[in-house]
Interface confidence: medium
């Protein structure tokens, strides 16, 4: 609880706020939780804090961790917890799900795409906007203030926006990309008994003790808009939120998104600092909609090295 | 030392509207937020609503939502709790309160309202 | 809306007696609870705030306990000024009190 994940990629601007709720006038504390060291306040720091901000300028792989945040009220202390996990830049077009913010949904009508996260950041307009890594051209497109609209929405505009915006600091620029699936709704749809694609029924997945492993779980449900449609990650037949681990967290957003014309919903199990005790656990990929349940099991098991002589 | 002194107590009428004021002193108002509390003769605490003084955000328990006002006054210190369309079951000592977004840490000596026709 | 159980409703116990009161809420709310007591006639008082952190200048016979949707207020050995009613409050959506616990002098 008060644990909020949050990632991004090296070489760009992070900014993190502080999940515990509270006025702009409180004072907070930074520390990384691990050691207990203060974060400094500076700002000729790479990483600093700034009240309930914490701004990594630019992020590194290395700044990956929790870190405290204590929110001094007069009257109370409170404290939360950022879960921060910067990512190497990927070398192709592929955005990984666990790069993609919360999936947005438009029709004619509608068909507003807000940059995620864009609202922590110290930004002019306008926006960069990148449909599946190609830069969006012509005249459907506009980008206005900290969304994108399209007009005349067709099936064929969903996919993975991403924007790209320039942070402000001190006089000094640094760059953030955030993308995001944008799904279009189709009146013609029809719902599936929930198919799994990821991952397979009963996988064993290897992980390395002590480092970080994403898990997937990714279902079909249909065709067009879904009216419930939901994936979720149980452990050991528990809800997340029922299992007080803040190293494993589920995603809040769930990433929808069409593969060959079927509506399919994502949502990613984050282990932070592998531990031996979580090779113990059942993990759970529920899939649910208004036909039923489905329910996929993945196991975890210690990466083997082989030595070659 | 924090002190918070509500207004006198009130008879209304049903149908009528009330409106409490609470004074905080040795404590700036906008540093914390300000918290209603509904307590009925003999029984339990109710939270009513919250505000943020600094900026007039409120947020009001769904019980009350649409009875309810809260409202400050930055400049005096003061924090009001306005009850609209008042019922015989909102006689109660009503109490307000300062502290943090998640509770309440110093309370005022509570207003009672006594709805009779 | 997030439901709270307190229990027992009242108990009675005597001076010295270590007295547990229980609340139970629905749904997982983590440590957002706090524990206040209030007396006949006067404004609630903080003791304790999320779960176990106490109130400065309360007596450190008092003490909180649980996490998820089980909580605790231990006191450890009571005190005649002890003898008031107990309120949890949660904080995790909104504010909701419990019912009370009415503590008497058996």
């Known amino acids: 609880k008060f644990s909020k994940q949050s990632w991004g990629l090296e070489n760009e601007a992070l900014i993190v706020r502080c999940p515990r709720q509270g006025k702009s006038s409180y004072i907070v504390d930074w520390y990384y939780s691990q050691t207990n060291k203060s974060i400094p306040t500076q700002e000729r720091n790479r990483v600093f804090a700034s009240g309930q901000l914490l701004k990594f300028l630019p992020a590194e792989v290395a700044d990956s961790g929790i870190y405290t945040c204590i929110v001094r009220s007069p009257t109370f202390n409170r404290t939360g917890y950022a879960n921060v996990t910067i990512y190497k830049k990927q070398p192709d077009c592929n955005v990984p799900d666990y790069l993609m913010y919360s999936t947005v949904s438009g029709s004619e009508k509608n068909s507003k795409i807000y940059c995620p996260t864009i609202d922590l950041y110290n930004w002019t307009a306008p926006l960069e906007w990148f449909k599946n890594c190609q830069a969006l051209q012509g005249s459907r497109y506009k980008a206005h203030k900290s969304f994108l609209v399209i007009d005349n929405v067709m099936t064929d505009d969903a996919g993975d926006y991403t924007c790209k915006f320039i942070h402000n600091e001190n006089g000094a620029n640094y760059s953030v990309t955030a993308t995001r699936s944008f799904t279009v709704k189709d009146e013609q749809g029809f719902s599936l008994f929930p198919v799994i694609r990821a991952p397979a029924h009963n996988e064993t997945k290897e992980v390395e003790i002590g480092e970080n492993t994403n898990l997937t779980c990714s279902a079909c449900f249909g065709k067009g808009a879904q009216f419930l449609a939901t994936v979720q990650w149980q452990l050991n037949g528990n809800k997340i939120t029922d299992f007080s681990e803040p190293r494993i967290q589920q995603e809040e957003g769930q990433n929808q998104s069409f593969s060959n014309g079927l509506a399919c919903v994502n949502t990613v199990l984050r282990i932070a600092d592998v531990k031996e005790e979580d090779l113990l656990l059942r993990y759970d990929c529920l899939a649910l909609n208004l036909h039923g349940l489905r329910r996929h099991t993945i196991r975890l098991s210690r990466k083997h090295h082989h030595h070659h002589h | 030392e924090v002190q918070l002194v509500q207004s006198g107590a009130e008879v209304k009428k049903p149908g009528a509207t009330v409106k409490i004021s609470c004074k905080v002193s040795?404590?700036?108002?906008?540093?914390?937020?300000m918290h209603w509390v509904q307590q009925a003769p003999g029984k339990g605490l109710e939270w009513m609503g919250r505000?943020?003084?600094?900026?007039?955000?409120?947020e009001y328990a769904e019980k009350f939502q649409g009875r309810v006002t809260i409202t400050a006054d930055t400049s005096t210190d003061t924090a009001y709790m306005e009850l609209s369309s008042l019922r015989s079951e909102d006689t109660a000592v009503y109490y307000c309160?300062?502290?943090?977004?998640?509770?309440?840490?110093?309370w005022g000596q509570g207003t009672l309202v006594t709805v009779s026709s | 809306d997030i439901q709270m159980t307190q229990s027992p409703s009242s108990v009675s116990a005597s001076v010295g007696d270590r007295v547990t009161i229980t609340c139970i809420t629905n749904?997982?709310?983590?440590?957002?609870i706090h524990w206040y007591q209030q007396k006949p006639g006067k404004a609630p008082k903080l003791l304790i705030y999320?779960?176990?952190t106490l109130r400065p200048g309360v007596p450190s016979r008092f003490s909180g306990s649980g996490s998820g949707t089980d909580f605790t207020l231990t006191i450890s050995s009571l005190q005649p000024e002890d003898f008031a009613t107990y309120y949890c409050?949660?904080?995790?959506?909104?504010?909701?009190f419990g019912q009370g616990t009415k503590l008497e002098i058996k």
């Open positions: 749904t997982d709310i983590d440590d957002v």
């Open positions: 040795a404590f700036n108002i906008k540093d914390d937020y």
């Open positions: 409050l949660q904080s995790d959506n909104m504010l909701t």
């Open positions: 999320e779960g176990n």
């Open positions: 309160a300062t502290g943090d977004f998640y509770a309440m840490a110093y």
């Open positions: 505000i943020d003084p600094a900026i007039g955000n409120t």
